[in-house]
């Protein structure tokens, strides 16, 4: 659920990492409502995630790990 | 009722490595985080690395990457933790613990810990 | 040394209130949900308080748990002697990208 570039909600799905090709961070102060994960999916879709779920910080580990290691 | 099922306690040689294993029954294994968690003698608990069986991927703490290796088979809804090149200071017990996919490092329910003594 | 600072020991009388504070920062508690343990000599931990101050059923509501910028504090209140136990605060750490937990309290009822 996003609107102009900022998410309002966060899916009630949890993602496959393998789906998932990078991710943004949306914070509540700097101009949006919430903070949110935006994760970028293969497809090339935006999905909106609960930064304080724990597969959210999984994911967001391992994609950050990915990117030190490249 | 959810239980976490671990081997029994070793004890090991320096240099030598350690498999513990913690079997879950009463919930779906598939569902949520495994993590692993030690506690050395009179110390604090520390995290180690963890695996959501559904993703298939471990994850592991800075300290221990490069020797220890999170499984997860969910034919048998058993997750593994193995430990290389163990030294004394890994003397310490090591739990296994559920934690919610949906709330963050909460972890429900744990092993009663399996108690890994490294000593020549 | 823990990323989460607790003090190492706490007391008090039966029926007292104790209060244990835990202390972190912007990377941790401030954006992150604290979960509390209990951890009875020689059994593992216990999950005590989840999401900053949700009680799991079964967990007296003596215990209780509250969170304000960058520390967290859980306060037992009525204190009985079956709460002689080390309490740990946990939460996740955005700057390390992992779970941390503090160094544990040991709680003494005189």
């Known amino acids: 659920a996003s609107n102009f570039d900022c998410c309002l909600g966060y899916t009630d799905r949890i993602l496959h990492p393998k789906f998932i090709v990078g991710f943004t961070r949306q914070l509540a102060n700097e101009g949006c409502d919430i903070n949110a994960i935006i994760f970028h999916t293969k497809k090339k879709l935006s999905v909106c995630a609960n930064p304080k779920q724990t597969w959210v910080k999984y994911i967001v580990r391992l994609l950050s790990k990915k990117v030190k290691n490249m | 009722q959810v239980q976490l099922q671990q081997s029994g306690a070793e004890v090991k040689k320096p240099g030598s490595s350690v498999k513990v294993s913690c079997k879950a029954s009463?919930?779906?294994?598939?569902?949520?985080?495994i993590s692993w968690v030690r506690q050395a003698p009179g110390q604090g608990l520390e995290w180690m690395g963890g695996i959501i069986p559904t993703f298939g991927i471990a994850d592991y703490a800075q300290k221990f990457q490069g020797r220890v290796t999170i499984t997860a088979d969910e034919s048998t809804s058993t997750a593994y933790m193995e430990l290389t090149g163990l030294r004394s200071e890994d003397t310490a017990m090591y739990y296994c613990?559920?934690?919610?996919?949906?709330?963050?490092?909460?972890?429900?329910?744990w092993g009663r810990g399996t108690m890994v003594t490294v000593s020549s | 040394q823990s990323v989460l600072t607790q003090p190492p020991s706490a007391s008090g009388t039966p029926g007292q209130r104790v209060t244990i504070s835990c202390s972190g920062s912007?990377?941790?508690?401030?954006?992150?949900?604290v979960n509390w343990y209990k951890q009875l000599p020689g059994t593992a931990p216990k999950l005590l308080i989840y999401s900053d101050y949700q009680r799991p059923s079964g967990v007296p509501d003596r215990f209780s748990a509250s969170k304000s910028g960058t520390s967290a504090s859980l306060a037992i209140s009525g204190l009985q002697s079956e709460d002689e136990a080390d309490y740990y605060c946990a939460t996740w750490d955005d700057s390390l990208n992992g779970p941390v937990f503090g160094g544990g309290t040991k709680v003494t009822v005189l």
């Open positions: 912007s990377s941790n508690i401030e954006i992150n949900t």
């Open positions: 613990a559920r934690g919610q996919l949906e709330r963050l490092g909460e972890y429900d329910y």
């Open positions: 009463g919930g779906t294994f598939s569902s949520y985080a």
